[in-house]
Interface confidence: medium
């Protein structure tokens, strides 16, 4: 039975040209995390594998950095980065947990700075 829950940063915003940390946290389970996939819509951004470490998709290598932890840092943000991001936790024996984050990249300097994991 899947008992775990994923906490995410929820809806966050950041300024164009800036950076943001996408963070998920799996709790309430003793399942072993074997791999975390980060996706934007259905496009794979990065993977953190327990055995093999980090892999960043070639098309995002210049703008995506691994970490902190199992999180993902997006850099040089553009308005096109606005949208849904998913953290997909592969665990054993529970199965797969998915968390959702919505990022809005703003043109102006009115981005909310309240998000816990946002980089100033």
């Amino acid at each position: 039975m899947m008992t775990g829950t994923i906490e995410t940063t929820g809806n966050i915003s950041a300024e164009k040209g800036g950076s943001i940390i996408l963070q998920c946290h799996l709790s309430s389970t003793t399942a072993q995390v074997t791999q975390v996939n980060w996706e934007q819509q259905d496009q794979l951004l990065a993977i953190c594998n327990a055995d093999l470490g980090w892999h960043i998709s070639p098309s995002f290598k210049d703008r995506v950095a691994p970490g902190p932890g199992l999180g993902l840092t997006l850099q040089s943000l553009t308005v096109n980065d606005t949208g849904e991001y998913f953290c997909i936790y592969h665990t054993y024996p529970d199965g797969t947990y998915t968390g959702r984050i919505f990022l809005e990249v703003l043109e102006s300097s009115v981005a909310e700075h309240g998000a816990r994991f946002q980089i100033p």
């Epitope: 259905d42 327990a50 892999h55 997909i88």
Partner: antibody, heavy 121, light 107 residues
């Protein structure tokens, strides 16, 4: 050259044991997750077990949990399946298969030719 | 566990036909869907991964589409060597699960 070759299948009585081997060649074995997948005669495919590249993480289907153990020897590029307390319903062709690679977990690009396990009295 | 259901279970078609096989997942698997081809007495062969990516060496007449719970495999113009059994498999979560197969036969 076939990159995966299974061996060790045969006829065994119910309750008996068997050890299947899969010899890998032509790729860096230690970089890949590996699986055992079986197919009963005339039936579909059933995933059996899975092992991470280092061998530190092992997964098993509920139908074989506690009876089958998967292991690997990266120095010898070999995958093993120890099968205990065999039942008639374990009769199948057993394939070893390679995970496609980083980011494509649970998707299998290389398969062996299979080895037949028959459990019968 | 995630259940995979294929339809039809068997299909008769002629060389040159366009054929579509469908696969439905019991829950959202995003794009984590794989298609295999199996010929009698042979091991399965990977055709399509992540729903629409063509495996290297697979002819371009094979294509895959879909996301979420509904997926399709299309063969644009059947060739004699395409008559085989086709399986879908969800690669989203352990335990991996396969569809029951679709046997493609010559009409």
């Amino acid at each position: 050259q076939v990159p995966l070759v299974e061996s060790g299948g045969g006829l065994v009585r119910p309750g008996g044991s068997l050890r299947l081997s899969c010899a890998a060649s032509g790729f860096t074995f230690s970089d890949y997750y590996m699986s055992w997948i079986r197919q009963a005669p005339g039936k579909g495919l059933e995933w059996v077990s899975y092992i991470s590249s280092s061998g530190s993480t092992v997964y098993s289907a509920d139908s074989v949990k506690g009876r089958f153990t998967v292991s690997r020897d990266n120095a010898k590029s070999s995958l093993l399946l120890h099968m205990n307390s065999l039942r008639a319903e374990d009769t199948a062709i057993y394939y070893c298969a390679r995970d496609r690679g980083f980011g494509e977990s649970y998707c299998f690009d290389y398969w062996g030719q299979g080895t037949l396990v028959t459990v019968s009295s | 566990d995630i259940q995979m259901t294929q339809s039809p279970s068997s299909l008769s078609a002629s060389v040159g036909d366009r054929v579509t096989i469908t696969c439905r997942a019991s829950q959202n698997i995003r794009s984590y869907l794989t298609w295999y081809q199996q010929k009698p007495g042979k091991a399965p062969k990977l055709l399509i991964y992540t729903a629409s990516s063509l495996q290297s060496g697979v002819p371009s007449r094979f294509s895959g589409s879909g996301s979420g719970t509904d997926f399709t495999l299309t063969i644009s113009s059947l060739q004699p060597e395409d008559f085989a059994t086709y399986y879908c498999q969800q690669s989203y979560s352990i335990p991996c699960s396969f569809g029951q197969g679709t046997k493609l036969e010559i009409k």
